[in-house]
C-alpha cells in the first residue's frame, strides 16, 4: 500500500531513506531542457523476489531540443552535483543486497535527472531525519518516521527531533543515543505491516552507514 | 474504496474531438500516475498515454501523439483523455486505468467512443 | 517500441484441462504482468513481477518466464476461466494481442 502523504516536515531538517522497501517507486524526472525518452520509463520500482531486490525499470533523459536521441545513463561527476542538496554529500555505503531482504538502495543518479526526487512510499517504510547545516540536533527520541496502516488510512509517525539554530551539525543519523519513544517505533500490528524486524534491519543498517545525499523533496 | 468513475459514451463524427473524463475517489488522487487505454471491438489493449496528477507530468504513446492531450484536475480529482481529428478507427472503448507501481490496479468502466459519419 | 507476441490467439479447452499461454517480447524485459477480461468488463490485474499473483487470484494461476519468454499456466481449468488474457511489459506499456480461453 502506498502512503498517502509525505513524511512530516521538520523546520530546519531533511529527511533520508536508508533502504527502500518493496513497491516503492521514484517518479523518472528531468531537469529543464530535458525530457524522458520517448516510450520511456515513467518511474523505477523497486521489486524482487525474497532473496533480491533491484529497481526495475531505468530513468533516460534526453535533450527536448534533440529527436531520438538518448543520453547515457551514467552520471558523469559533474551532473551529479547539479541536484538540489544539503551540504551533505558523502555518498552512501552500498549496502550487500542479502543483509537487507526486500529492500533496495538509493538508486544511482541518472543523466540530467530533475533537481529533486519523487518517490512514493509504502507502509512500513522507515525515513531519518537530520538537521541542515547550521542547526543543531535536540533528540528527545527517535530522529525517524515511520508510514504505518491504522484503519485502512496511512499516516507517518512524528520524529522526535528539533533543529536548533547553533551553529554546529550533529551526525547522521544520531550521533547521540536515542531514547526509546513509543511514538517513533513501529509497534507490530497486523494492520500496518510493519515489523521489529524492519526496525531493526534498517536501524542497524543506519548506524553502519556514512550520510546519504540528500534531496529536498520526497513525495 | 477506490473508484474510477468514467463520462459516458459518445458518437463523433469523423474529424471532430472528443473529452472522456474519469474521476478518481477513495485514495490520494495527486500521488499515482493514471493512464489512458483503448481497446477497438475484439482488439487488444492500447496504451495511449498517462499522467502524474501531482505536478502534471505526461507521457504519450508515439501512436497517439500530437492527437492525444492528458490533463488533471485536481480539486475535483478528475482526469481527463482529448483525442483529436477523429476517424473510423478510433471507435474503441476507452479506460482509465490507476498505476500501483506493479500494475493497473483500478480501471474505470470504460467509455465507449464511436465515430461515423 | 517493444511488442509482445501471444500464443495462440484463441484455445478451445476443456475443464480440468492444463493450459499454457505464451508471451514473447521482442527485446528481453525484467518482468512480464497478466491481466483477464472478461466480455463487456474491464481488465483485472492477474499476475504481476511474473510470477506473482495478484489478490484474489485461484491459486491454479501461476507465471513463469525470463528474458523475452513467459509462460501464464492454468493447472486446472474452471468454466470461470474463460476470457481473454493479455500480457503486458510494465515498462514500455504494450500489451500481447490477447489470448481468448473458451470453454469446450
Known amino acids: 500500500e502506498l502512503c498517502d502523504d509525505d513524511p512530516p516536515e521538520i523546520p530546519h531538517a531533511t529527511f533520508k531513506a536508508m533502504a527502500y522497501k518493496e513497491g516503492t517507486m521514484l517518479n523518472c524526472e528531468c531537469k529543464r531542457g530535458f525530457r524522458r525518452i520517448k516510450s520511456g520509463s515513467l518511474y523505477m520500482l523497486c521489486t524482487g523476489n525474497s532473496s533480491h531486490s533491484s529497481w526495475d525499470n531505468q530513468c533516460q533523459c534526453t535533450s527536448s531540443a534533440t529527436r531520438n536521441t538518448t543520453k547515457q545513463v551514467t552520471p558523469q561527476p559533474e551532473e551529479q552535483k547539479e541536484r538540489k542538496t544539503t551540504e551533505m554529500q558523502s555518498p552512501m555505503q552500498p549496502v550487500d543486497q542479502a543483509s537487507l531482504p526486500g529492500h533496495c538502495r538509493e538508486p544511482p543518479p541518472w543523466e540530467n535527472e530533475a533537481t529533486e526526487r519523487i518517490y512514493h512510499f509504502v507502509v512500513g517504510q522507515m525515513v531519518y531525519y537530520q538537521c541542515v547545516q547550521g542547526y543543531r540536533a535536540l533528540h528527545r527520541g527517535p530522529a525517524e518516521s515511520v508510514c504505518k496502516m491504522t484503519h485502512g488510512k496511512t499516516r507517518w509517525t512524528q520524529p522526535q527531533l528539533i533543529c536548533t539554530g547553533e551553529m554546529e551539525t550533529s551526525q547522521f543519523p544520531g550521533e547521540e543515543k536515542p531514547q526509546a519513544s513509543p511514538e517513533g517505533r513501529p509497534e507490530s500490528e497486523t494492520s500496518c505491516l510493519v515489523t521489529t524486524t524492519d526496525f531493526q534491519i534498517q536501524t542497524e543498517m543506519a548506524a553502519t552507514m556514512e550520510t546519504s545525499i540528500f534531496t529536498t523533496e520526497y513525495q | 474504496q477506490v473508484q474510477l468513475v468514467q463520462s459516458g459514451a459518445e458518437v463523433k463524427k469523423p474529424g471532430a474531438s472528443v473529452k472522456v473524463s474519469c474521476k478518481a475517489s477513495?485514495?490520494?488522487?495527486?500521488?499515482?500516475?493514471m493512464h489512458w487505454v483503448r481497446q477497438p471491438p475484439g482488439q487488444r489493449l492500447e496504451w495511449m498515454g498517462a499522467?502524474?496528477?501531482?505536478?502534471?507530468?505526461?507521457s504519450y504513446s508515439q501512436k497517439f501523439e500530437g492527437r492525444v492531450t492528458i490533463t488533471a484536475d485536481t480539486s475535483a480529482s478528475t482526469a481527463y483523455m482529448e483525442l483529436s481529428s477523429l476517424r473510423s478507427e478510433d471507435t474503441a472503448v476507452y479506460y482509465c486505468?490507476?498505476?500501483?507501481?506493479?500494475?493497473?490496479?483500478?480501471w474505470g468502466q470504460g467509455t465507449t467512443v464511436t465515430v461515423s459519419s | 517500441q517493444i511488442v509482445s507476441t501471444q500464443s495462440p490467439d484463441t484455445q478451445s479447452v476443456t475443464p480440468k484441462e492444463k493450459v499454457t499461454i505464451t508471451c514473447r517480447a521482442s527485446?528481453?524485459?525484467?518482468?512480464m504482468q497478466w491481466y483477464q477480461q472478461k466480455p463487456d468488463q474491464s481488465p483485472k490485474r492477474w499476475i504481476y513481477d511474473t510470477s506473482k499473483s495478484a489478490s484474489g487470484v485461484p491459486s491454479r494461476f501461476s507465471g513463469s518466464g525470463s528474458g523475452t519468454d513467459y509462460t501464464l499456466t492454468i493447472n486446472s481449468l474452471e468454466a470461470e476461466d474463460a476470457a481473454t488474457y493479455y500480457c503486458h511489459q510494465r515498462s514500455s506499456y504494450t500489451f500481447g494481442q490477447g489470448t481468448k480461453l473458451e470453454i469446450k
Open positions: 499522467i502524474y496528477p501531482g505536478n502534471s507530468d505526461t
Open positions: 527485446s528481453s524485459r525484467s518482468y
Open positions: 477513495g485514495y490520494s488522487f495527486t500521488r499515482y500516475w
Open positions: 486505468s490507476r498505476d500501483y507501481g506493479y500494475y493497473f490496479d483500478f
